[in-house]
Interface confidence: low
């Protein structure tokens, strides 16, 4: 990170960047580098792509090390072949409704996610595809014993527990918080983020934390057992530090990560947590950066293509980690 | 009407606990955070820490080690608790409302002397 | 660490329009940290007037606008009134934390 030493360049020659990715003069002005893109972890040596408009947004003051890349106020979105201004609307099929905010897509599901319980005027409530209608409906079904009805109800509760919350509602804002993306990275150290109007003035934010679906080094294969083809989540053997760009966790972490699949499918985090990490630099330096902790995984065979930054919000979501962080504040 | 009141003691001893009680009315505190901020005698506003409306904390860096902010929403209550107190510690301590800091409590000022 | 600066005084003559400065010493203000502005009249409690850059709180007259423009967030107050007379204090949330400005003093002249 500190530009007072001698220029040291890794290579001789130019680095050949992926289509698309700008080759820059790296933030001390000694060498030539690949700019890093939107979501990835960027320094003073690895800056993010200007040509796109991004910038490395440090986050708290105090953490000038490390920072992720952020499109500038008013970046425009690229969404199924589509360009959209920041802070436009649209919905990208009949389920989903999307906003573009400063380069990032977050969409909010327009059909109902509700539980229907048991209630003695709908005994046995089921979804269904009507046609001509985007969204599954609820249809109450006639049982086919009366006697069944008793059981059946035993779930049922006079309060709407799945009702909207009355405590999000601020000023007519309806709070809606994407899920948290999928890990930028398959192993090693990545960036999961989520957009939210969960904040004070219901304004649209992004929200981003680090992530590990599970380390690089692991040769996790060779654990799964004979006659298995999966295995969903490894014992990790001993408590780890997490490393980031030359700075190392404060804390030991008995973490959890996603195991390997020899049949074609992927682990993924199924449900998550989101925990603040503190991290010690060479320089004596602490940041605190927000970081995934898995709690399940599920292994699945939608696996998009790594680059498909979209297909993540229908395939990879992660669960169980809706609570505002500080959010987020 | 919106109301916050704090409560607790107006002298404290050095290296004493200070524990002050911000009551609210008017509003939930599952609907609002309370942000705890204190004025130094003739100085500025110094922002201490806030309990968010779902529970969660944060700190000023400087009194993190010091600082534990819980509430109980069904009494409308935060509590606000200060270790290791010193005579520096003495101010006029606030609550405050979340939401553009729109409502305070009329404070509590607080002696730290042996 | 994050340090935000006020004039320590600023005056107006009645009717006419003041603003009020609130800069960041570590670069541009954003929307992201949600510019506050509080009131402390003298020998009462404070009351909010801004949140969110530029957000009014309930009750708080048209006269008080906010705004932001580079390193800064701004308080602007048209119509002076002898009743504005008052301490005026900016917070700015960094991530994790707010940090309150030293404060300035409204002088309304006359």
């Known amino acids: 990170q500190d530009c007072s030493a001698q220029c040291q360049c890794a290579a001789e020659a130019a680095p050949h960047c992926p289509a698309g990715v700008s080759l820059v003069l790296d933030g001390c002005g000694c060498c030539r580098v690949c700019a890093k893109q939107l979501g990835e972890l960027c320094t003073e040596r690895d800056p993010c792509d200007p040509h796109k408009g991004l910038f490395c947004d440090f986050g708290s003051p105090a953490n000038r090390k490390i920072g992720v890349c952020t499109a500038k106020d008013g970046a425009p979105c690229v969404f199924g072949g589509s360009v959209y201004r920041s802070g436009e609307s649209f919905q990208s099929s009949c389920k989903y409704q999307c906003t573009c905010l400063d380069g990032a897509v977050g969409c909010v599901p327009l059909c109902s996610m509700d539980v229907r319980l048991p209630s003695p005027d709908c005994p046995f409530p089921r979804r269904v595809k009507l046609p001509g209608k985007c969204c599954e409906e609820w249809v109450c079904d006639e049982p086919k014993d009366r006697t069944a009805v008793g059981p059946a109800l035993a779930a049922y509760r006079l309060e709407d527990t799945f009702g909207p919350d009355p405590t999000m509602m601020r000023a007519n804002c309806l709070v809606q918080t994407t899920e948290w993306s999928a890990c930028s990275k398959t192993c090693g150290m990545g960036i999961s983020t989520r957009v939210t109007n969960d904040n004070t003035f219901c304004r649209l934010e992004k929200q981003s934390r680090l992530c590990m679906v599970r380390p690089c080094e692991a040769d996790l294969e060779e654990n799964i057992k004979k006659g298995k083809k999966c295995i969903r989540t490894p014992k990790i053997a001993k408590p780890v530090k997490f490393e980031l760009s030359g700075c190392t966790s404060v804390k030991t972490y008995r973490a959890k990560f996603c195991g390997v699949c020899t049949d074609g499918r992927c682990c993924t985090p199924h449900r998550t947590t989101t925990l603040p990490v503190e991290f010690k630099c060479p320089d004596g330096e602490i940041m605190k950066k927000n970081m995934m902790f898995i709690k399940t995984c599920a292994c699945h065979y939608n696996c998009p293509g790594d680059n498909d930054i979209f297909e993540s919000l229908y395939y990879r979501k992660m669960y169980g980690d809706m609570a505002h962080h500080h959010h987020h504040h | 009407e919106v109301t916050l009141k704090e409560s607790g003691p107006v002298l404290v001893k050095p290296t004493e606990t200070l524990t002050l009680t911000c009551t609210v009315s008017?509003?939930?505190?599952?609907?609002?955070?309370v942000h705890w901020i204190r004025q130094p005698p003739g100085k500025g506003l110094e922002w201490l820490g806030v309990?968010?409306?779902?529970?969660?904390?944060d700190y000023n860096a400087a009194f993190m080690s010091r600082l534990t902010i819980s509430k109980d929403t069904s009494k409308s209550q935060v509590v606000f608790t200060m270790t290791n107190m010193d005579p520096v510690d003495t101010a006029t301590y606030y609550c405050a409302r979340d939401g553009g800091f729109d409502y305070w409590g009329q404070g509590t000022t607080v002696t730290v002397s042996s | 660490e994050s340090v935000v600066t006020q004039p320590p005084s600023v005056s107006g003559a009645p009717g006419q329009r003041v603003t009020i400065s609130c800069r960041s010493s570590?670069?541009?203000?954003?929307?992201?940290?949600?510019a506050n502005w509080v009131q402390q009249l003298p020998g009462t409690a404070f009351k909010g007037l801004i949140g969110?850059?530029?957000n009014r709180a309930p009750g708080v007259p048209d006269r008080f606008s906010g705004s932001k423009s580079g390193t800064s967030a701004s308080l602007a107050i048209t119509g002076l009134q002898a009743e504005d007379e008052a301490d005026y204090y900016c917070?700015?949330?960094?991530?994790?934390?707010?940090?309150f400005g030293g404060g300035t003093k409204l002088t309304v002249l006359g």
């Open positions: 309990i968010w409306r779902r529970g969660g904390t």
């Open positions: 917070a700015l949330w960094y991530s994790t934390h707010y940090v």
């Open positions: 008017g509003f939930s505190l599952s609907t609002f955070g």
């Open positions: 969110g850059t530029s």
């Open positions: 570590i670069g541009a203000v954003t929307t992201s940290n949600y």
